[in-house]
């Protein structure tokens, strides 16, 4: 659910981290209406996720650790 690169809502599905290659943070105070994590998948899809949900936090941390270790 995105429009002009802004997420307008969140996915109701849980994405498995093995399908995700990276993420972008969307901040509500930077031109968009809501805070969101935009997950980028191996199939070049962008998926809007709720940054407050536990599964989203876990994946963000896992991806952040991968970047640190590179």
């Amino acid at each position: 659910a995105s429009n002009f690169d802004c997420c307008l809502g969140y996915t109701d599905r849980i994405l498995h981290p093995k399908f995700i290659v990276g993420f972008t943070r969307q901040l509500a105070n930077e031109g968009c209406d809501i805070n969101a994590i935009i997950f980028h998948t191996k199939k070049k899809l962008s998926v809007c996720a709720n940054p407050k949900q536990t599964w989203v936090k876990y994946i963000v941390r896992l991806l952040s650790k991968k970047v640190k270790n590179m």
């Epitope: 981290p17 940054p51 407050k52 949900q53 536990t54 599964w55 876990y58």
Partner: antibody
Framework: EVQLVQSGAEVKKPGSSVKVSCKAS????????ISWVRQAPGQGLEWMGG????????NYAQKFQGRVTITADESTSTAYMELSSLRSEDTAVYYC??????????????WGRGTLVTVSS | QSVLTQPPSVSAAPGQKVTISCSGS????????VSWYQQHPGKAPKLMIY???KRPSGVPDRFSGSKSGNSASLDISGLQSEDEADYYC???????????FGTGTKLTVL
């Protein structure tokens, strides 16, 4: 009614390791995270880390990174927490707790009864 | 050392109302859900409030939660003797990428 059933109390020597188990009785692990929280005598609660079994990968608090390993076996609905290089300060009650990962209830809604780990020479 | 700060103790008479505060920052309370736990001596913690102000089934409506900016509060009205316990606030911290518990507050019912 889902219950988290933990393994029994342990007495360990300094420098050794301990492995505590947590079995989800009457339910499954799907769409939940299992966290481990410890409480030293007379102290507060401390999050050690957690795992989303369907992901298979764990997150750890920086304080315990490298010393704790959290795993889960989906087939038996059991989570494990192993803490190595034990010292006397690790004497504590270790709890497992369940959290809904899609946020229907954002918080640890079900807790195990705790496992007392005593580290003493 | 927790970065969610609570008063060490609060007390009030039965029937009175008490407020327990929890002070944090933008990276935890400001941007994330807050939950509250009650713990009686020798027992496991019990979830009392989640998502700032929601109550799990079975928790009396005497317990309520709120949030303003980087601080959260737990209100307990009509105090009863069984409310005497330790209370902990909790929230995820985006900067640390880990879950934090507050320092804990001992509630005494006089």
């Amino acid at each position: 009614e889902v219950q988290l059933v933990q393994s029994g109390a342990e007495v360990k020597k300094p420098g050794s390791s301990v492995k505590v188990s947590c079995k989800a009785s009457g339910g499954t692990f799907s769409s939940y995270a299992i966290s481990w929280v410890r409480q030293a005598p007379g102290q507060g609660l401390e999050w050690m880390g957690g795992i989303i079994p369907i992901f298979g990968t764990a997150n750890y608090a920086q304080k315990f990174q490298g010393r704790v390993t959290i795993t889960a076996d989906e087939s038996t609905s059991t989570a494990y927490m192993e803490l190595s290089s034990l010292r006397s300060e690790d004497t504590a009650v270790y709890y497992c707790a369940r959290e809904d990962i899609v946020g229907a209830v954002d918080g640890f809604d079900i807790w195990g009864r705790g496992t007392l780990v005593t580290v003493s020479s | 050392q927790s970065v969610l700060t609570q008063p060490p103790s609060v007390s009030a008479a039965p029937g009175q109302k008490v407020t327990i505060s929890c002070s944090g920052s933008t990276s935890n309370i400001g941007n994330n859900y807050v939950s509250w736990y009650q713990q009686h001596p020798g027992k496991a913690p019990k979830l009392m409030i989640y998502d700032v102000s929601k109550r799990p089934s079975g928790v009396p409506d005497r317990f309520s939660g709120s949030k303003s900016g980087n601080s959260a509060s737990l209100d307990i009205s009509g105090l009863q003797s069984e409310d005497e316990a330790d209370y902990y606030c909790a929230a995820w911290d985006d900067s640390l990428s880990e879950f934090l518990f507050g320092t804990g507050t001992k509630l005494t019912v006089l």
